[in-house]
Interface confidence: medium
């Protein structure tokens, strides 16, 4: 599924992202613009021999399994296809859960690169939230 | 047990399509990718792609792009490998596979011929 | 793309002989290498994933080592059931590739 802007703000509201760990609701909608332009279905391979998966682009290497990364940590305990769903729950779990693990939303490559220091809040502008 | 079970034997024209089965059994057939692998007497083992059934997510080795298209069809556990445009060079033994970066679990194979 | 060059393509071996067969990648695979073997007629059989981990399954005479580019399947005591194409194959990056083959025969 490819959400809409607000369609996906919606949505990530309802499973409690806004303000999670202190990332208001604008940071995640612009990450996953970034990530994968709002598509659920986005995969992409790296370098390493791992897959980001789904709409925040979530790395087989460490947090779910999809089987065929070397050395995967599966953090998220959760195979990568389920990142996957038109139902963003899993991958919302799983976010909280990598966003809780130091770094912040600097885990997101291209939250760092295009949203940090930037006004996120553009990305809920005009949403009936 | 994990098995891959393929469709059988063709024999097709030069220009014609061909639609090659894996059907899967044993396993979460969403959850892990399908390799496709092509072997001809003389030219060893080919990669040609793969698709992950839970989304339809593909990818392609450059050198098949425009040769070969997957689908899956996850009602009955079945992988699919269109092949267009045949000529004699597509003639082979095509193989599915499960993607686990290696490749525990092989299908028996599909023997292609194109032949006028 | 990793080019995997096998050595030699074909080995003529006696039972009871022990044989090592090589795979050297163009590029550095850390230890994303997989060795199989492949009887005529039937679908190829995974031997070693990891370059040294055996499957369950393979008898002990089977082993794999080597780590970046040069990798080596060791056969102790090569068995009649033994003879065939062996491949080597790269998960390191996109395409997969596979070696050229060896053929172990008979001498």
């Known amino acids: 599924k490819v959400f809409g802007r607000c369609e996906l703000a919606a949505a990530m509201k309802r499973h409690g992202l806004d303000n999670y760990r202190g990332y208001s609701l604008g940071n995640w909608v612009c990450a996953a613009k970034f990530e994968s332009n709002f598509n659920t279905q986005a995969t992409n391979r790296n370098t390493d021999g791992s897959t980001d998966y789904g709409i925040l682009q979530i790395n087989s290497r460490w947090w779910c399994n999809d089987g065929r990364t070397p050395g995967s940590r599966n953090l998220c305990n959760i195979p990568c296809s389920a990142l996957l769903s038109s139902d963003i729950t899993a991958s919302v779990n799983c976010a909280k859960k990598i966003v809780s693990d130091g770094n912040g939303m600097n885990a997101w490559v291209a939250w760092r690169n295009r949203c940090k220091g930037t006004d996120v809040q553009a990305w809920i502008r005009g949403c009936r939230l | 047990q994990v098995q891959l079970q393929e469709s059988g034997a063709e024999v097709m024209k030069p220009g014609a399509s061909v639609k090659i089965s894996c059907k899967a059994t044993?396993?979460?057939?969403?959850?892990?990718?399908i390799e496709w692998v092509k072997q001809r007497p003389g030219h060893g083992l080919e990669w040609i792609g793969e698709i992950l059934p839970g989304s339809g997510s593909t990818y392609y080795n450059e050198k098949f792009k425009g040769k070969a298209t997957f689908t899956a069809d996850t009602s009955s556990n079945t992988a699919y490998m269109q092949l267009s445009s045949l000529t004699s060079e597509d003639s082979a033994v095509y193989y599915c596979?499960?993607?686990?970066?290696?490749?525990?679990?092989w299908g028996q194979g599909t023997t292609l011929t194109v032949s006028s | 793309d990793i080019e995997l060059t096998q050595s030699p393509a074909t080995l003529s071996v006696t039972p009871g002989d022990s044989v090592s067969l090589s795979c050297r990648a163009s590029?550095?695979?850390?230890?994303?290498l997989h060795w199989y073997q492949q009887k005529s007629h039937e679908s190829p059989r995974l031997l070693i994933k990891?370059?040294?981990q055996r499957v369950s399954g393979i008898p002990s005479r089977f082993s794999g080592s080597g780590s970046g580019t040069d990798f080596t399947l060791s056969i102790n005591s090569v068995e009649t059931e033994d003879f065939g194409m062996y491949f080597c194959q790269q998960s390191n990056s996109w395409p997969r590739t596979f070696g050229g083959g060896t053929k172990l025969e008979i001498k």
């Open positions: 990891y370059a040294s």
């Open positions: 590029q550095s695979i850390s230890n994303n």
């Open positions: 596979a499960r993607g686990d970066g290696w490749y525990c679990y």
């Open positions: 044993g396993y979460t057939f969403t959850t892990y990718w």
